[in-house]
Amino acid sequence: EVEKTACPSGKKAREIDESLIFYKKWELEACVDAALLATQMDRVNAIPFTYEQLDVLKHKLDELYPQGYPESVIQHLGYLFLKMSPEDIRKWNVTSLETLKALLEVNKGHEMSPQVATLIDRFVKGRGQLDKDTLDTLTAFYPGYLCSLSPEELSSVPPSSIWAVRPQDLDTCDPRQLDVLYPKARLAFQNMNGSEYFVKIQSFLGGAPTEDLKALSQQNVSMDLATFMKLRTDAVLPLTVAEVQKLLGPHVEGLKAEERHRPVRDWILRQRQDDLDTLGLGLQGGIPNGYLVLDLSMQEALS
């Protein structure tokens, strides 16, 4: 807490300008009017204040706006945003995408901080849903943003917003998140033709069910191994050798290198060895010829 001292003669700030960088902390407290600071916040960013000086400026704004800053001030916080705590930010009502962009710009090049996470949460809750423009903005600053949301939060993403998602935005998503995003993507891209559809849906296929994979296998899509390896194991297991061959096209040869890894390993275990042999890849571990396969899960369901 800075002591209340009188402003020295001739030092009363008439405007927010560069001369303030030479003020000591107590001089800033005594000589800068909070209302003046609020109306000229846009000037603060271009002035090289120290963190200690920024602390004083924040303190002045906190006194002026104990219930939370108005958006006109928030939009111009700039570097001062890094001084805010999540508790401060929870008092704000941020509705403008321009304000959100301005504050994300300040944190650019750094990991998502608790302040940024709180700001985004406040903004999205205020909007009611994660619309396309917001998603565009957030993934531009934080490619991993989507994958940081819970499946529940992802359920508020409208299918129209899926057009803003780039493949790299989904890199860190787990199957539970892709389970939520895949049906939205399928809906969003439903009017595209075969090859274009596959290009767009490919990144989301980690959430695709068996029947959709079977349908894709009829479309000569030539799925690459990296995509295949991200498919849900339970969705891959029911696929026949012929279906996998059609799904992968020329990439089928890559199965050999992945035969010890899921989902390829588990899929091999479910196939007849003589079916696997037709691929000519030397895949081993299939069901030997003459063995009867009982689907125990089916049996349990019937009993």
């Epitope: 405007e15 560069e18 001369s19 960088i21 120290t50 700039g78 650019k108």
Partner: antibody, heavy 115, light 111 residues
Framework: QVQLVQSGAEVKKPGSSVKVSCKAS????????FSWVRQAPGQGLEWMGG????????NYAQKFQGRVTITADESTSTAYMELSSLRSEDTAVYYC????????WGQGTLVTVSS | DIALTQPASVSGSPGQSITISCTGT?????????VSWYQQHPGKAPKLMIY???KRPSGVSNRFSGSKSGNTASLTISGLQAEDEADYYC???????????FGGGTKLTVL
């Protein structure tokens, strides 16, 4: 339109002093920070010091401390830089620049130190 | 004393994009958003191209952009043109001496 106009080229003897002026027009003078930067032939930019005219007191780079004096005259909107005890390695173009971001620069003043 | 490190030279062909880096420490480039970039043609005064890491003064082409990641700031010039051939300097504000510190400069050659 902001303009910074500097005084003309100077030729000085080693051990002497030089005073370069920088007259500002087209904007507020008193509350801006004015810097002096020099550039020796074929070399990079080197900050020497600066002043906020309304306060009058200047601050200097350690390298030039004691040898450079920066002043400002609010009545004529002019900043000055005086460098004393000149030596041959002080031969350079000297620039004044406005604000900490240095958004406007003077045209430069060539100071040649030679015996 | 703060020291900002820049590559001595960079080159590119017309139409290409080039990036010039400026590396400092967590207490200057990394800690604050006060990085500026200046362009200097031979025999001319420097010109401010970028301030506060990524802001462009009015009149500067949007082919010039600034960014920062960790302790390194970068100037990117897209759609390279012959008139971009010049020396480029990064600078930051040094709170300890209350003054400006410049990088060593980078000579950009347009092939």
């Amino acid at each position: 339109q902001v303009q910074l106009v500097q005084s003309g080229a100077e030729v000085k003897k080693p051990g002497s002093s030089v005073k370069v002026s920088c007259k500002a027009s087209g904007g507020t003078f008193s509350s801006y920070y004015f810097s002096w930067v020099r550039q020796a032939p074929g070399q990079g930019l080197e900050w020497m010091g600066g002043i906020i005219p309304k306060f009058g007191s200047a601050n200097y780079a350690q390298k030039f401390q004691g040898r450079v004096t920066i002043t400002a005259d609010e009545s004529t909107s002019t900043a000055y830089m005086e460098l004393s005890s000149l030596r041959s390695e002080d031969t350079a173009v000297y620039y004044c620049a406005r604000r900490t971001s240095m958004d406007y620069w003077g045209q430069g003043t060539l100071v040649t130190v030679s015996s | 004393d703060i020291a900002l490190t820049q590559p001595a030279s960079v080159s590119g062909s017309p139409g290409q994009s080039i990036t010039i880096s400026c590396t400092g420490t967590s207490s200057d480039v990394g800690g604050y958003n006060y990085v500026s970039w200046y362009q200097q043609h031979p025999g001319k005064a420097p010109k401010l191209m970028i301030y506060s890491v990524s802001k462009r003064p009015s009149g500067v082409s949007n082919r010039f952009s600034g960014s920062k990641s960790g302790n390194t700031a970068s100037l990117t010039i897209s759609g390279l043109q012959a008139e971009d051939e010049a020396d480029y300097y990064c600078a930051t504000w040094d709170h300890s001496q209350m003054g400006k510190v410049f990088g060593g400069g980078t000579k950009l050659t347009v092939l």
